[in-house]
Interface confidence: low
């Protein structure tokens, strides 16, 4: 999916008002320095591409993020403010429903959500130069 035509300001507002708090809640109990950021993004469409991938695509050691509060809100924000996004996700969501068994918070998931926090922060500061 091409995120170029999303309403970035509306998505940013949704992140600041609610998604960010859900990410903090998920990460509660971990130190902010515990994980190194290994994923980055260069502009807002790129950031949303990475955010969507890390949030909804199961990875080795972490297959359980899609039903978390922050993921549900991320999905809603993308579906509302990215034209045509929801249609592209129908098949992927159905496949995920079949695969998912139970919710387990692993260290790998915590690391993944830490990466997500970094991507969202970058999404909110699109004019900053890359380090």
């Amino acid at each position: 999916y091409d995120f170029t035509n999303c309403d970035f300001e509306k998505i940013k507002a949704a992140y600041l008002s609610t998604i960010s708090k859900d990410l903090i809640t998920y990460m509660s109990g971990t130190k902010s320095t515990e994980f190194n950021n290994t994923v980055s993004c260069s502009n807002r469409p790129h950031c949303l591409t990475e955010i969507q991938s890390l949030t909804f695509n199961p990875t080795a050691g972490c297959a359980s993020l899609a039903k978390e509060m922050f993921a549900m809100k991320t999905k809603a924000a993308l579906a509302i403010w990215c034209p045509g996004y929801s249609e592209t996700q129908i098949n992927a969501t159905q496949a995920m429903k079949k695969r998912r068994k139970r919710k387990v918070t692993t260290n790998k998931c915590l690391e993944q959500v830490s990466q997500l926090q970094g991507l969202w922060r970058r999404f909110n500061r699109p004019l900053l130069k890359q380090q």
Epitope: K21, D22, M72, I80, S86
Partner: antibody
Framework: QVQLQESGPGLVKPSQTLSLTCTVS????????VSWVRQPPGKGLEWLGV???????NYHSALISRLTISKDNSKSTVYLQMNSLRAEDTAVYYC????????????WGQGTLVTVSS | EIVLTQSPGTLSLSPGERATLSCSAS???????LHWYQQKPGQSPRLLIY???NLASGVPDRFSGSGSGTDFTLTISRLEPEDFAVYYC?????????FGQGTKLEIK
């Protein structure tokens, strides 16, 4: 079973602050959201805002500067405060429970009529 | 903001007839976020259909919902006297909540 009950002053003067209470039973506010919806006499439904289980809130963009939703989990009570009231805020105010994390309101209170008049 | 427009504003039909109520979104939305409510005078709204086509608990199967993208429909296959009420469509996503202006279904 799930129940919601609104209570409030009934009559409020213009420019004053409205304080409403929604007392819930049959579920816990620690892991469920509660939303406020209003309906002016003879008109349609207007969503005002929501407070989620974790305490995070979302507000109607046109009312965000006038509206505060809070809660006391231990008292199973959700509060709505709206300041700078005007005549057009006259409405029946409902609290409603979203089904999980969604905008699906499966349970509603009976509503409380608030009249803004001097 | 996404705006939901319902049509017609008022629908006059007789018991036994078929009712078709429309809800149009100003931009495309996921079918997961479109819901319908029924409201009778002096009563709270009642959830009728959620996620476009799923009947809420206790709702008779003469009610059905369909649609995708920007156009959604609530159909009552055979009107009963108790079906005459106001119907609202709603965009409810957990981030955004918007109601249509309502369609009044009245007895002809």
């Amino acid at each position: 079973q799930v129940q919601l009950q609104e209570s409030g002053p009934g009559l409020v003067k213009p420019s004053q602050t409205l304080s409403l209470t929604c007392t819930v039973s049959g579920f816990s506010l620690t892991n469920s959201g509660v939303s406020w919806v209003r309906q002016p006499p003879g008109k349609g439904l207007e969503w005002l805002g929501v407070i989620w289980g974790d305490g995070s809130t979302n507000y109607h963009s046109a009312l965000i500067s006038r509206l505060t939703i809070s809660k006391d989990n231990s008292k199973s009570t959700v509060y709505l405060q709206m300041n700078s009231l005007r005549a057009e805020d006259t409405a029946v105010y409902y609290c409603a429970k979203p089904d999980g994390y969604s905008g699906i309101f499966a349970y509603w209170g009976q509503g409380t009529l608030v009249t803004v008049s001097s | 903001e996404i705006v939901l427009t319902q049509s017609p504003g008022t629908l006059s039909l007789s018991p036994g007839e078929r009712a078709t109520l429309s809800c149009s979104a100003s931009s495309s939305i996921s079918s997961n976020y479109l819901h319908w409510y029924q409201q009778k005078p002096g009563q709270s709204p009642r959830l009728l259909i959620y996620r476009t086509s799923n009947l809420a608990s206790g709702v008779p199967d003469r009610f059905s919902g369909s649609g995708s993208g920007t156009d959604f429909t609530l159909t009552i296959s055979r009107l009963e006297p108790e079906d005459f009420a106001v119907y609202y469509c709603q965009l409810g996503s957990g981030i955004l909540f918007t109601f249509g202006q309502g369609t009044k279904l009245e007895i002809k």
